[in-house]
């Protein structure tokens, strides 16, 4: 849960109460125990962008 008064995190990131900042949900694949990963499960990651047409 995001701390009161904090701006919402951008898509693909989630609020970390342990660090007092938004953290990239991509890191949860490597370390799923991080506190912010709970918020990542609720919000889908940023849409995948192809690097070529």
């Amino acid at each position: 849960e995001q701390a009161p008064g904090q701006a919402p995190c951008s898509r693909g990131s989630s609020w970390s109460a342990d660090l007092d900042k938004c953290m990239d949900c991509a890191s949860c694949r490597a370390r799923p125990h991080s506190d912010f990963c709970l918020g990542c499960a609720a919000a889908p990651p940023a849409p995948f962008r192809l690097l070529w047409p």
Epitope: A3, S16, A17, D18, L19, D20, M23, R31, H33, D35
Partner: antibody, heavy 120, light 108 residues
Framework: EVQLLESGGGLVQPGGSLRLSCAAS????????MMWVRQAPGKGLEWVSY????????HYADSVKGRFTISRDNSKNTLYLQMNSLRAEDTAVYYC?????????????WGQGTLVTVSS | DIQMTQSPSSLSASVGDRVTITCRAS??????LNWYQQKPGKAPKLLIY???SLQSGVPSRFSGSGSGTDFTLTISSLQPEDFATYYC??????????FGQGTKVEIK
Amino acid sequence: EVQLLESGGGLVQPGGSLRLSCAASGFTFSPYPMMWVRQAPGKGLEWVSYISPSGGSTHYADSVKGRFTISRDNSKNTLYLQMNSLRAEDTAVYYCARGGDTYFDYFDYWGQGTLVTVSS
Amino acid sequence: DIQMTQSPSSLSASVGDRVTITCRASQSISSYLNWYQQKPGKAPKLLIYAASSLQSGVPSRFSGSGSGTDFTLTISSLQPEDFATYYCQQSYSTPGITFGQGTKVEIK
């Protein structure tokens, strides 16, 4: 130069209390998570407690949960550890350490330590 | 909690020797492994973070490698100031941070 200076250690009887302090200087204290780590005489390192930059989130090792309380005063650049119901097995050198700026990744600066002896 | 096991617990070496210390985690910790050096009566000092990244100011003779469960700290050419105790530490299973039991490097 980053400096962390612990104080407040000493001899205390079992069941007693102590409050450790860690004064930080040489860096902006408020953005960094902080930790306490201890080392019993002749033994290895044991993580004790963690506090988030704002102080809103805290974590404790099972061995101290319910007895120790970590806190910080960012206006005074100081970290604290309130230790209650002390036991002989809490005898150790207590270090404060600065956390990395990502997520619990490492302790990059440590204080010199303060010795806590619990004995009757 | 994840258990960290270092080997050997102590070793004797001479100045100029190549020294290798290993650290094994009880489960995979990816690359969330740090190494510290501690001299008697002093605070630990960060040497290596994220398994292989050298902390600023640490001599290049120190290097780290490994991922998953097996990690290595290597001192390529031991110097007199390197005689100390070395600890590994995992930062994967937060907040249950754990250290290895330490490896004491002594003069032969």
